[in-house]
Interface confidence: low
């Protein structure tokens, strides 16, 4: 029989390399079976977590797990750093694994096209 | 050539809405993130926010949470930024701006439209 | 919120005088993996929309002058005119693009004696 506790996917040790300035959705898997657990994200600032209160958060529902998206619109350098997300669950607090985001500025600035060619080649864009 | 026209100078009752435009044109429209900018008379500049035309996604500076709504119309490459609740304090100058299209200089804003006046005053 | 501090908030110069000017901000825009500053600098002429001059604390903006200059690191940066014209008297602001919100730093204008 299938256990009905609360369940959060996140993998050991996850990682995600990501562009500061791009949009990016950490997905928290969460498996529950009637009522939707409350899910929060925090990030973690040494041996405390630090609850992101006033960021976007969303839920996408499939048809055998949800996910719990915490948005980044955009990535900015202090992105950078380990996350956790936890659900209430009849008073129980379940916590996953971290996942860590390494946010990168891939491109150099001597590769930073000028404002004539931005507007003048835009094929740039699609780089 | 890159280009942001605002629409024109507003005049508003406090307590009541207005709502900006900014048409964008020269570029596509859809990969740059589209920043709006308050400047009160005489004084420095505060970032209210920005949307991304591509998907909808936005962000907030806290302090214009509430006060400030941030639309796009892909179809005619035009940003609108809604104010509501109006007081005197709101009374400035309004830009749109925007930035490059990758890394975090989507977050400097090499292009600006020439701003728009809004006065409230009953 | 990081917080941009401006100094001076006004300077008078002569034409072809050297003037700097400083910025500082409450915490690092020093990203160590890769080694950038996340400032920049914008001119902004009386009655006119601001003008990116430099990006990464010291990268020029294409079709900016070679005689402005930026520098400094972490928390201090420093925005230099060589040889000021008179068509450089405006009000110059820096931005920290580090984190949200982004913030500007109150403006140095910058004036004929």
């Known amino acids: 029989k299938e256990s009905c506790d609360v369940q959060l996917y996140i993998k050991r040790q996850s990682e995600h390399s990501i562009l500061a300035g791009d949009p990016f959705e950490l997905e928290c898997p969460v498996k529950y079976c009637a009522n939707r657990p409350h899910v929060t994200w925090c990030k973690l600032n040494g041996t405390t977590c630090v609850k992101l209160e006033d960021r976007q958060t969303s839920w996408k529902e499939e048809k055998n797990i949800s996910f719990f998206i915490l948005h980044f619109e955009p990535v900015l350098p202090n992105d950078n750093g380990s996350y956790r997300c936890s659900a209430n669950f009849q008073s129980n607090l379940i916590e996953s694994h971290s996942t860590t985001l390494y946010v990168t500025d891939v491109k150099s600035a001597s590769e930073r096209p000028s404002k004539d060619e931005m507007a003048s080649r835009p094929w740039l864009l699609y780089r | 050539e890159v280009q942001l026209q605002q629409s024109g100078p507003e005049l508003v009752k406090p307590g009541a809405s207005v709502k900006m435009s900014c048409k964008a044109s020269?570029?596509?429209?859809?990969?740059?993130?589209m920043h709006w900018v308050k400047q009160s008379h005489g004084k420095s500049l505060e970032w209210i926010g920005y949307i991304y035309p591509n998907n909808g996604g936005n962000g907030y500076n806290q302090k214009f949470k509430g006060k400030a709504t941030l639309t796009v119309d892909k179809s005619s490459s035009t940003a609108y930024m809604e104010l509501r609740s109006l007081t005197s304090e709101d009374s400035a100058v309004y830009y749109c701006?925007?930035?490059?299209?990758?890394?975090?200089?989507?977050?400097?804003?090499?292009?600006w439209g020439q701003g728009t006046l809004v006065t409230v005053s009953a | 919120d990081i917080v941009m501090s401006q100094s001076p908030s006004s300077l008078a110069v002569s034409v072809g005088e050297k003037v700097t000017m400083s910025c500082k901000s409450s915490q690092s825009l020093l990203y160590s993996s890769n080694q950038k500053n996340y400032l920049a600098w914008y001119q902004q002429k009386p009655g006119q929309s601001p003008k990116l001059l430099i990006y990464?604390?010291?990268t020029r903006e294409s079709g900016v002058p070679d005689r402005f200059t930026g520098s400094g690191s972490g928390t201090d940066f420093t925005l230099t005119i060589s040889s000021v014209k008179a068509e450089d008297l405006a009000v110059y602001y820096c931005?920290?693009?580090?984190?949200?919100?982004?913030?500007f730093g109150a403006g140095t204008k910058l004036e004929l004696k």
């Open positions: 020269g570029y596509t429209f859809t990969d740059y993130y």
């Open positions: 701006a925007i930035g490059d299209y990758y890394g975090s200089l989507r977050l400097t804003f090499a292009y």
């Open positions: 990464w604390a010291s």
């Open positions: 931005q920290q693009y580090y984190s949200y919100p982004l913030t």
